[in-house]
Interface confidence: low
């Protein structure tokens, strides 16, 4: 507000009166001035701040015929439908020459039935879980006493005797309604009625029961659901991308989750069609007729490795005298884990099989015993992961090497005199 000067020659001859009434009241405040010369514009202040959008009218009447004679100015401020925001100290302000003059103040007050500043809101709560409801009302006149009602039944013997602004509810087992009454000397006002919907508690102890490469069996403990039986539980699984960053309490997964519904009881579910050796995050929520519980936190789980689902591909075995060159390609079928290497077995018609671990190489040169006269030599290859061997390839007979056929140099592997491994199932 501008600086004011309360000089002796204040132009004000009438100051705003006081208005006190109930909400919705209409009233008028007036200021009267006597000024010499051109009359000024009258501004209204509320609590020292200029009212930019005041509903004011100004009437000015000259007391003589000369412009330099005195004028009487009356400014009226109309307050329509009195609200709390209208209350305060009202003054008129005028600029005259280089001086600012401010009227004596008038006050606008409110008095009537209690007015709610805050009312109980609809909300959902978990069964048997404490929560608070808020209700706040004011006059004037003060004091304002509150009386809470649950399902239309008062929670105290009289207004002001029970909880006031905040009602602590230790827990509900059924959906209920709450309201509050505000009492003052002028009467009673009733708040809106809030519906508190009782949902199941968040399930607890979500855990893995068993793991297979493409399925996980999970179980959980249901929370209380009040008088409403659980109808089903919903499990979500989402692939855990390393950069995905699902936090313990993150509300939504970053991609569309795999959602499964479980009839309850039992509180257990087998999640199938998963990728082997893959990290997932899972969570569960349970639903009653009133609605779903909150989700559990995301639980990190992982499917175990499986064995490769197919044998190595495109196996070729070529013989040149006492050497045999074998090479192959990685299985086209899913590996179901991290490929650790290949096993190779070869066997002649009347000789014991020889088993070798080749590691991750995809080719090997075998140094055959003797002059290489072993007949009907066949080779089989299998890929393996930490979970074990995948299926062996069909036996591939060694073909004689023909001139012009490429024979790259490879590390030679001497055939041991006895089988390197014993594979009873071979």
């Amino acid at each position: 507000a501008p600086r004011g000067t309360q000089a002796e020659e204040s132009p004000f001859v009438g100051n705003p009166g006081n208005i006190t009434g109930a909400r919705g009241l209409t009233g008028t405040l007036r200021c009267q001035l006597q000024v010499q010369g051109e009359p000024p514009e009258v501004h209204w202040l509320r609590d020292g701040q200029i009212l930019e959008l005041a509903d004011s009218t100004q009437t000015q009447v000259p007391l003589g015929e000369d412009e330099q004679d005195d004028w009487i100015v009356v400014s009226q401020l109309r307050i329509t439908s009195l609200q709390l925001s209208d209350t305060g100290q009202y003054q008129c302000l005028v600029f005259l020459g280089h001086q600012t003059f401010v009227s004596q103040p008038g006050y606008v007050g409110l008095e009537g039935l209690p007015y709610f500043l805050e009312e109980p809101e609809d909300r959902t709560v978990a069964a048997n879980t404490p929560f608070n409801l808020s209700c706040q009302a004011q006059g004037p006149p003060e004091p304002v006493d509150l009386l809470w009602l649950q399902d239309a039944v008062p929670l105290a013997t009289a207004p002001g005797h029970g909880p006031q602004r905040s009602l602590h509810v230790p827990g509900l087992n059924k959906t209920s309604s709450f309201s509050c009454e505000a009492h003052n000397a002028k009467g009673v006002t009733t708040s809106r009625t809030a519906t508190i919907t009782v949902l199941p508690q968040q399930p607890r102890n979500l855990h893995l029961v068993s793991r297979q490469p493409t399925e996980l069996e999970v179980a959980w403990t249901p929370g209380l659901s009040g008088i409403y039986p659980l109808t089903h539980c919903t499990l979500q699984a989402v692939l855990s991308d390393d950069g995905m960053g699902i936090q313990a309490g993150e509300p939504d997964p970053p991609e569309e989750p795999l959602t499964s519904q479980a009839s309850v009881p039992p509180h257990q579910l087998r999640l199938g069609s998963l990728h082997p050796h893959t990290p997932y995050h899972i969570r569960v929520a349970c639903t009653s007729s009133q609605g779903p519980s909150s989700w559990t936190h995301w639980l990190p789980v992982e499917t175990p490795e499986g064995v490769p689902l197919g044998p190595p591909e495109n196996i070729s075995a070529t013989r040149n005298g006492s050497q045999a060159f074998v090479h192959w390609q990685e299985p086209r079928a899913p590996l179901q884990g991290t490929l650790l290497g290949y096993r190779l077995a070869y066997q002649g018609q009347d000789t014991p099989e020889v088993l070798m671990d080749i590691g991750l190489r995809q080719e090997v040169t075998l140094e055959l015993q003797g002059d290489g006269s072993v007949s009907n030599l066949t080779v089989c290859v299998a890929a393996y992961t930490a979970a074990g061997d995948g299926p062996w390839s069909l036996p591939v007979p060694l073909e004689a090497w023909r001139p012009g056929q490429a024979q790259p140099v490879h590390q030679l592997v001497k055939e041991p005199s006895t089988p390197a491994f014993s594979w009873p199932w071979w």
């Epitope: 507000a1 501008p2 600086r3 004011g4 020292g48 401010v102």
Partner: antibody, heavy 120, light 107 residues
């Protein structure tokens, strides 16, 4: 409930710099102003400056300008007063105070005070 | 800058007395005057602003008045809890200035 909680007492040597904090709760931190006032032992109140956290705008008492920096971190609802080139005469209780919504220059809620002692 | 001159610097009074403290502004400030109460070891507490508006929770025995450059804080009936130091402050424009304080002591 409106609360302004200030950092603990500080003992500094002349020429040093001190930074004290004022964490607010119970109201919108960015709504009004935060004033800083000091009171030497047994003496009156002296306004240092203010900040409007919503835009970082500051106003300082010219007497202290150059040695004082007022700042605010909206994310943690905290205002700071940094005072450099401390002198023994800067020994005082330093208060943060919230500007009243009807006049930002009237102070309705105050911190408990931070005693800064400057001594060699 | 608006200077605030407060008087008296101290006064002795008894419980039930009417106490008046005055503050004079060096220039008019549109009634932008606040009054604070401070007890030893405590932060100041706002009593009055805009010269006469009581802050929330302040007992009605505290009242402010004045306009132009002369402002008064009145305690209509002094209570034991009212023995403290009182400060006026102009809150019209920066730099904000305080009066020197008035210490109200038990007679």
């Amino acid at each position: 409930e409106v609360q302004l909680v200030q950092s603990g007492a500080e003992v500094k040597k002349p020429g040093a710099t001190v930074k004290i904090s004022c964490k607010v709760s119970g109201y919108s931190f960015t709504g009004h102003t935060m004033n800083w006032i000091r009171q030497p032992p047994g003496k009156g109140l002296e306004w240092i400056g203010l900040i409007k956290p919503s835009n970082g705008g500051t106003s300082y008492n010219q007497k202290f300008k150059g040695r004082v920096t007022i700042s605010a971190d909206k994310s943690i609802s905290t205002a700071y007063l940094q005072w450099s080139s401390l002198k023994a005469s800067d020994t005082a209780m330093y208060y943060c105070a919230h500007g009243h919504y009807e006049s930002y220059f009237a102070m309705d809620y105050w911190g408990q005070g931070t005693l800064v002692t400057v001594s060699s | 800058d608006i200077q605030m001159t407060q008087s008296p610097s101290s006064l002795s009074a008894s419980v039930g007395d009417r106490v008046t403290i005055t503050c004079k502004a060096s220039q008019d400030n549109s009634s932008a005057v606040a009054w604070y109460q401070q007890k030893p070891g405590q932060a100041p507490r706002l009593l009055i602003y805009w010269a006469s508006t009581r802050h929330t929770g302040v007992p009605s025995r505290f009242s402010g008045s004045g306009s132009g450059t002369e402002f008064t804080l009145t305690i209509s009936s002094l209570q034991p809890d009212d023995f403290a130091t009182y400060y006026c402050q102009e809150h019209f424009s920066t730099p904000l200035t305080f009066g020197q304080g008035t210490k109200v002591e038990i007679k």
